[in-house]
């Protein structure tokens, strides 16, 4: 428990006075917060919170979902915490199966344990398939398992959190990893035709094709030396993972001489930008 020099505000005191507590499912959780300026208890698991304004937190029949961090806070904003594991052989993991990873970043598989004394807490592939050889992870019983430096190749990888309990492997529900690619090159842009010669009244239509790893790529048609918003229509396709194509079609239904000029298809992503132009000449 915390000790502070007299006169300074001190953090609350929690009974039982330990950082971690293990209780069996069905047993009572009884936590006492002692502080003259007690404000509240906060319970947190899977980043969700509940509050209790009584200084004694009592759960008569503990369930696995009562596993988590219990924090007592006083009026000075000082706090103290205890982590409670509710051991339930039928529910070894608490899970949130939403799993997204940004390429080259770490991502957390949220499967905290309800029993810290199980062994070999790790990740396993679904249907007995091995995990990718280069997949590295760090387990944390209170948070889950952190996958280090997500690769594009892990997209739609199916995995389970796994522990050994009494000599047997126990798996969590399935997680499907969805990887968001990092932009590592500028978009590829091309135009259906580099120049057009039209008579007044004819329709001008030109298509720009933008290719990139995801639909997050930005694109627009611009008229050079003009701020006027051009009317464009889009079609887009995913040709498998990380192969996105967009067609942006610019149309002027009845071209006029003063529509003549250079039109630019511009695209950018977080890596950089690219553009391509087409020239329209309208004669009367």
């Amino acid at each position: 428990q915390p000790s502070v020099s007299p006169g300074e505000p001190s953090p609350p005191s929690i009974h039982p006075g330990k950082s971690d507590l293990i209780v069996r499912v069905g047993d009572e959780i009884r936590l006492l917060c002692t502080d003259p300026g007690f404000v509240k208890w906060t319970f947190e698991i899977l980043d969700e919170m509940n509050e209790n304004k009584q200084n004694e937190w009592i759960t008569e029949k503990a369930e696995a979902t009562n596993t988590g961090k219990y924090t007592c806070t006083n009026k000075h904003g000082l706090s103290n915490s205890i982590y409670v594991f509710v051991r339930d052989p039928a529910k070894l993991f608490l899970v949130d199966r939403s799993l997204y990873g940004k390429e080259d970043n770490d991502t957390l598989v949220r499967c905290p344990l309800t029993d810290p004394e199980v062994t070999n807490y790790s990740l396993k592939g679904c249907q007995g398939k091995p995990l990718p050889k280069d997949l590295r992870f760090i387990p944390d019983p209170k948070a889950g398992i952190m996958i280090k430096s997500v690769k594009r190749a892990y997209h739609r990888l199916c995995l389970h959190c796994s522990v050994d309990q009494e000599g047997k492997s126990v798996l969590s529900e399935k997680f499907i990893l969805k990887v968001r690619p990092a932009f590592k090159a500028v978009p590829v842009v091309s135009v259906s035709k580099a120049s057009y010669l039209l008579r007044e009244g004819e329709e001008f239509t030109v298509t720009c094709t933008i290719k990139d790893v995801s639909s997050s790529v930005y694109s627009t048609w611009k008229r050079e030396n003009s701020q006027t918003k051009l009317q464009e229509k889009y079609n887009s396709w995913h040709h498998g993972d990380f192969n996105y194509e967009r067609q942006a079609t610019l149309t002027i239904s009845s071209a006029r001489v003063n529509d003549s000029g250079v039109f630019m298809c511009y695209a950018n992503n977080t890596f950089g930008s690219a553009n391509v132009t087409t020239t329209l000449e309208v004669v009367d």
Partner: antibody
């Protein structure tokens, strides 16, 4: 105890833009993805896009790309959606929804946007 | 884009009987046996409320009268028995693939 608070209504003029808020409480804001959904009587429910937890990356429905912009302020646990160049077709109820365990487990009450001169 | 087609568009069911709503996807919403299909209930002036997630899992606090089934492209929401409070519009939604999409809705009326 998870709550998503949205303003009830916004009245805006055609051509203007509107920035609506979604204030989150009861969970760690930076740990969950926030989605936005548009509802009109004619088009039903349409997914606009998502702002991902942690780094603020976004992904949009192509239909709303350039029309909507999603941002978040971690310090106030608030997600925002800005809609620009408003027309009558943008009149709708806009919801924020938190993704939890693969589904939209919590929704705001919605903001009714009316575009009128 | 994955298109979700709900049928029927509207449905009138007598109190105490069974209501069945169908949702068909234009392509599979399954990955490794997980169906990324969810069902929501919406009443006028309220946001959608989650009923069923991952095709067949009952959301906490939702009565067991609601059940979901199906896989790949064909999914069903069943309410049995129907109660007066179930009058609402029901939507299916997939989040297997961007952009996430919703069905057009089924309006349930209680006779």
């Amino acid at each position: 105890q998870v709550q998503l608070q949205q303003p009830g209504a916004e009245l805006v003029k055609p051509g203007a833009s509107v920035k609506m808020s979604c204030k989150a409480s009861g969970y760690t804001f930076t740990s969950y993805n926030m989605h936005w959904v548009k509802q009109t009587p004619g088009q039903g429910l349409e997914w606009i896009g998502v702002i991902y937890s942690g780094n603020g990356d976004t992904s949009y429905n192509q239909k709303f790309k350039g029309k909507a912009t999603l941002t978040a302020d971690k310090s106030s646990s608030t997600a925002y959606m800005q809609i620009n160049s408003l027309t009558s077709e943008d009149s709708a109820v806009y919801y924020c929804a938190r993704e939890r365990d693969t589904r939209f487990g919590n929704w705001g009450q919605g903001t009714l946007v009316t575009v009128s001169a | 884009n994955i298109v979700l087609t709900q049928s029927p568009a509207s449905l009138a069911v007598s109190l105490g009987l069974r209501a069945t709503i169908s949702c068909r996807a234009s392509e599979s919403v399954d990955i490794y046996g997980n169906s990324f299909m969810h069902w929501y209930q919406q009443k006028p002036g309220q946001p959608p409320k989650l009923l069923i997630y991952l095709a067949s899992n009952l959301e906490s606090g939702v009565p067991a009268r609601f059940s979901g089934s199906g896989s790949r492209t064909d999914f069903t929401l069943t309410i049995d028995p129907v109660e007066a409070d179930d009058a609402a519009t029901y939507y299916c939604q997939q989040n297997n693939e961007d952009p996430y999409t919703f069905g057009g809705g089924t309006k349930l009326e209680i006779k």
